[in-house]
C-alpha cells in the first residue's frame, strides 16, 4: 500500500516538476542585439539594419532566432520590445550633406503567413546640426508591449544609417517575453 | 492507511508550496531609485551619481542592495535596466557658460571579482540652449535587457550634473528581474 | 484503498492546477493604449489625454480597465509603465504660434481613496522649431517600475497636444504587471 502511495506521489511530483519547468515559461524567450558596425549601410533615407550581433559582448539570444537581419519569434506570447539608437557626427568625419536631419527609428513586425510589414513603434527627432559645433550626438529610445506569434519577425529601420554610433552600448534592440497569450 | 495518505499529501503540498514560492523567483528583485537632490555633484565631464533615494516617494528596493552610490545585484538573473534623466536650465538658475551642451547618461556595470567597469547603455544629445529662451529642458531615456551576476554593481554617470532636474519623476533609474539564468 | 488514493491525488492535482494558474499571476494584467486621433484636445498648455484605443491595431488590454481616459488598475502589483509620445509639425499645417516649444509628457497616478494625483514620470524637451525647415518631429519615451494598487488610475498629460502624431506606432502608453506585492 505504502509503496503504491510512494509511486503515486512520485507521479504527482514528476508531473508537477514538468509543470513547474513549463511555468518558467518554457525558458522565457529573449534577445538583446547590438549593432554590427562592420556592415552599416549608407544613405540618408530609411533603411533596414540587417547586421546585428547576437552572441558577443552584451548581445545574447535565447528561444528566439536571428536570421537575415530579423529577430524571429519562436514562441507565441506578449513581449516587451525596445530599441536604443544613437546617431553622432564629428567634424573630422567630413562635412554633412545637410545641417537639417531627420533622425528616426522604426521597429517593424513582419508576418510571413500574410506577407505584410507594420510599424510597431517609431521615434526620433528632426535636428539642426550646425557647423558651429565640432561634435553632434542624439539618441532615441522606444519601447512597448506587443503580442507576437511564432514565425513573426521583428526588424529595425533607421534614417541616416551612416551617422549611427557603432558602440554596443549605443545602438541595440531587444525583446523579452512577459506572458503567454491566454 | 488514510492517515498515512494524508501525511504523504501534506508532504506533497508542502514541497510544492515551497516550489511555488521559489517559482515566484525568490521574491523577484527590483529597484527604482530617485535622485537625491541634496547632493548632486558639479563638473562638466562625466561624473558618477552616487546619491539616490531607495525608500521614499516612488523609490523602492527589494532583494537588491544600494550601497556607496551603486545598485548591487544579490541574485543572478536577466534584468531589465532603465534610466530616465532630465536636465533643465532657467535663466534664474545661474550663469550658464555655454550654449553648446553635451547632455549624456551612461549606465555602467562593475564587476568586483574582475575589477572592471563597462557601459551597458548610453544615451543623450548635444543641445544648443540659447539665451533667447528663458527656460530649457531635455530628457533621456534608456533601457535594455542584461545578464547580471550576484555581486555586480550598476551605477549611473552623467555629464553636466548641475543641470539635473531634482524631481523624483524626472531623474531616476531602476531594474527588475525578468528571468533566471538557465 | 487505491481508489481513495486516486481521489486524494486528484485533489492534489486539482489544487496545484489552481495554484499553477494563480502563479501565472491571475493572468498577468497589461495594457497598451494607442492615441485616438479623432479626439485630440487643442492648446499649448498641459492637458490630459483622454481618448485612447484599447482594442484595435496594436492596442490591447487585459485584467485592467480603461475608463474616462484613465487606465484603471484591477490587481495590486508592481508594474512597468511606459509611454511614447511623438510631436510633429509640417509647414502645410499652418504657422506655429511660437517657434519656442516645450514638448512634454507626464504620466500620473490618481488615487481615488485619497483623492490626489501625482506625477510618476516626466520627459520631454524644449525645442526651437524654426521656419527654416518645412518639417519638425520629436519623440519622448519614458518608462519606470511602480507599485500600483487596485483602483488607482494612470493617465497621460502632454503639452501642445495639437502637435501630437496620431499614428498608433507613435503615440501610446502602457503597463504590464511584473510581480506581486509581497
Amino acid at each position: 500500500g505504502s509503496q503504491h502511495i510512494r509511486a503515486e506521489k512520485a507521479m504527482v511530483d514528476g508531473s508537477w516538476l514538468d509543470l513547474a519547468k513549463r511555468s518558467k515559461l518554457e525558458a522565457q524567450p529573449f534577445a538583446h542585439l547590438t549593432i554590427n558596425a562592420t556592415d552599416i549601410p549608407t544613405g540618408s533615407h530609411k533603411v533596414s539594419l540587417s547586421s546585428w550581433y547576437h552572441d558577443r559582448g552584451w548581445a545574447k539570444i535565447s528561444n528566439m532566432t536571428f536570421s537575415n537581419g530579423k529577430l524571429i519569434v519562436n514562441q507565441d506570447g506578449f513581449y516587451y520590445l525596445y530599441a536604443n539608437i544613437c546617431f553622432r557626427h564629428h567634424e573630422t568625419s567630413g562635412d554633412l550633406a545637410t545641417e537639417y536631419l531627420q533622425l528616426m527609428v522604426y521597429v517593424t513586425k513582419t508576418s510571413i503567413k500574410i506577407p505584410s510589414s507594420h510599424t510597431l513603434m517609431k521615434g526620433g527627432s528632426t535636428k539642426y546640426w550646425s557647423g558651429n559645433s565640432e561634435f553632434h550626438f542624439y539618441s532615441i529610445n522606444v519601447g512597448g508591449f506587443f503580442k507576437l506569434r511564432s514565425g513573426e519577425e521583428i526588424s529595425v529601420e533607421v534614417s541616416n544609417p551612416s551617422l549611427l554610433d557603432p558602440d554596443q552600448d549605443a545602438t541595440y534592440f531587444g525583446a523579452f517575453k512577459v506572458r503567454d497569450i491566454d | 492507511g488514510s492517515q498515512h495518505i494524508r501525511a504523504e499529501k501534506a508532504m506533497v503540498d508542502g514541497s510544492w508550496l515551497d516550489l511555488a514560492k521559489r517559482s515566484k523567483l525568490e521574491a523577484q528583485p527590483f529597484a527604482h531609485l530617485t535622485i537625491n537632490a541634496t547632493d548632486i555633484p558639479t563638473g562638466s565631464h562625466k561624473v558618477s551619481l552616487s546619491s539616490w533615494y531607495h525608500d521614499r516617494g516612488w523609490a523602492k528596493i527589494s532583494n537588491m542592495t544600494f550601497s556607496n552610490g551603486k545598485l548591487i545585484v544579490n541574485q543572478d538573473g536577466f534584468y531589465y535596466l532603465y534610466a530616465n534623466i532630465c536636465f533643465r536650465h532657467h535663466e534664474t538658475s545661474g550663469d550658464l557658460a555655454t550654449e553648446y551642451l553635451q547632455l549624456m547618461v551612461y549606465v555602467t556595470k562593475t564587476s568586483i571579482k574582475i575589477p572592471s567597469s563597462h557601459t551597458l547603455m548610453k544615451g543623450g544629445s548635444t543641445k544648443y540652449w540659447s539665451g533667447n529662451s528663458e527656460f530649457h529642458f531635455y530628457s533621456i531615456n534608456v533601457g535594455g535587457f542584461f545578464k547580471l551576476r550576484s555581486g555586480e554593481e550598476i551605477s549611473v554617470e552623467v555629464s553636466n550634473p548641475s543641470l539635473l532636474d531634482p524631481d523624483q519623476d524626472a531623474t531616476y533609474f531602476g531594474a527588475f528581474k525578468v528571468r533566471d539564468i538557465d | 484503498g487505491s481508489q481513495h488514493i486516486r481521489a486524494e491525488k486528484a485533489m492534489v492535482d486539482g489544487s496545484w492546477l489552481d495554484l499553477a494558474k494563480r502563479s501565472k499571476l491571475e493572468a498577468q494584467p497589461f495594457a497598451h493604449l494607442t492615441i485616438n486621433a479623432t479626439d485630440i484636445p487643442t492648446g499649448s498648455h498641459k492637458v490630459s489625454l483622454s481618448s485612447w484605443y484599447h482594442d484595435r491595431g496594436w492596442a490591447k488590454i487585459s485584467n485592467m480597465t480603461f475608463s474616462n481616459g484613465k487606465l484603471i488598475v484591477n490587481q495590486d502589483g508592481f508594474y512597468y509603465l511606459y509611454a511614447n509620445i511623438c510631436f510633429r509639425h509640417h509647414e502645410t499645417s499652418g504657422d506655429l504660434a511660437t517657434e519656442y516649444l516645450q514638448l512634454m509628457v507626464y504620466v500620473t497616478k490618481t488615487s481615488i481613496k485619497i483623492p490626489s494625483s501625482h506625477t510618476l514620470m516626466k520627459g520631454g524637451s524644449t525645442k526651437y522649431w524654426s521656419g527654416n525647415s518645412e518639417f519638425h518631429f520629436y519623440s519622448i519615451n519614458v518608462g519606470g517600475f511602480f507599485k500600483l494598487r487596485s483602483g488607482e488610475e494612470i493617465s497621460v498629460e502632454v503639452s501642445n497636444p495639437s502637435l501630437l502624431d496620431p499614428d498608433q506606432d507613435a503615440t501610446y502608453f502602457g503597463a504590464f504587471k511584473v510581480r506581486d506585492i509581497d
Epitope: 558651429n132 | 558639479t42 545661474g94 550658464l96 557658460a97 551642451l101 539665451g131 | -
Partner: antibody, heavy 122, light 107 residues
Framework: EVQLVESGGGLVKPGGSLRLSCAAS????????MSWVRQAPGKGLEWVSG????????YYPDTVKGRFTISRDNAKNSLYLQMNSLRAEDTAVYYC???????????????WGKGTTVTVSS | DIQMTQSPSSLSASVGDRVTITCKAS??????IAWYQQKPGKSPKLLIY???YRYTGVPSRFSGSGSGTDFTFTISSLQPEDLATYYC?????????FGGGTKVEIK
C-alpha cells in the same frame, strides 16, 4: 601659444564712453566663455562681466549693470566691452580672461591678458 | 553677493617655510574656490580650482583644501619666485567675487 591681448584703454571724462577689445589666439575661441575682470590701483580683483561661448548669454554685477555691455565676434576671435556713463570708480586695469572648462554654472579663469588701463578723470 | 574674507592681508616668511593663507566665504560655497597668484606688475595666474585641484603645470608645493565656508591655501616650501599677492575667488554663484588678497614677502 594661448594669448589674450587687450586694447582700447585710455583717459576718459566722467560720463564718457570707451570700448575695449580683446584679441584671442592659440585656442578655439568659440568654445570658451569669456570675462572682463578689473583691478583698481593698489586694490584687489573685481569681476565686471561675462559672456557665454556662443554670445547669447551676458552677465554683469550690479555695479556695472546697465552701463557696460559685453559682446563677442567668434569669427574674429574677439571680445569687447562697451563702457558707457563712466565714473571715477571705474578707473582700473581691465583684464580679458578666459573661463576654464568646468561645471557650466561655475566661472574661474585660466588665461589672462596683460590688461589695458582705463582712467576716468576730469 | 558672497563676500570673501582673506587673511592675513600680508605675511613675511623665509625660503623653505610652510605658508598658509585662509579664505572665508559669507555662505556655503561647497568646494567652489579658486586661488590665483599675481606677481608684481603681472596679470593673475590660476593655481587651484574647486578648492583642491591643481591647475595644469602648477608646482606640487601649492595646494588647497576646505569646503563649505572655510578654505586654506598652502605653499609647502616657500621659494623666492613665490613673491606675489594671492587671491581666492568663489566660483559657486554669480557675481564671482574675490578675496582682498594676501601679499607674500620673502624675509
Amino acid at each position: 601659444e594661448v594669448q589674450l591681448v587687450e586694447s582700447g584703454g585710455g583717459l576718459v571724462k566722467p560720463g564718457g564712453s570707451l570700448r575695449l577689445s580683446c584679441a584671442a589666439s592659440g585656442f578655439t575661441f568659440r568654445n570658451y566663455a569669456m570675462s572682463w575682470v578689473r583691478q583698481a590701483p593698489g586694490k584687489g580683483l573685481e569681476w565686471v562681466s561675462g559672456i557665454s561661448s556662443g554670445g547669447t548669454y551676458t552677465y554683469y554685477p550690479d555695479t556695472v549693470k546697465g552701463r557696460f555691455t559685453i559682446s563677442r565676434d567668434n569669427a574674429k576671435n574677439s571680445l569687447y566691452l562697451q563702457m558707457n556713463s563712466l565714473r571715477a570708480e571705474d578707473t582700473a586695469v581691465y583684464y580679458c580672461a578666459r573661463r576654464d572648462y568646468g561645471d557650466v554654472y561655475e566661472w574661474y579663469f585660466d588665461v589672462w591678458g596683460k590688461g589695458t588701463t582705463v582712467t576716468v578723470s576730469s | 553677493d558672497i563676500q570673501m574674507t582673506q587673511s592675513p592681508s600680508s605675511l613675511s616668511a623665509s625660503v623653505g617655510d610652510r605658508v598658509t593663507i585662509t579664505c572665508k566665504a559669507s555662505q556655503d560655497v561647497r568646494t567652489s574656490i579658486a586661488w590665483y597668484q599675481q606677481k608684481p606688475g603681472k596679470s593673475p595666474k590660476l593655481l587651484i580650482y574647486s578648492a583642491s585641484y591643481r591647475y595644469t603645470g602648477v608646482p606640487s608645493r601649492f595646494s588647497g583644501s576646505g569646503s563649505g565656508t572655510d578654505f586654506t591655501f598652502t605653499i609647502s616650501s616657500l621659494q623666492p619666485e613665490d613673491l606675489a599677492t594671492y587671491y581666492c575667488q568663489q566660483h559657486y554663484s554669480s557675481p564671482w567675487t574675490f578675496g582682498g588678497g594676501t601679499k607674500v614677502e620673502i624675509k
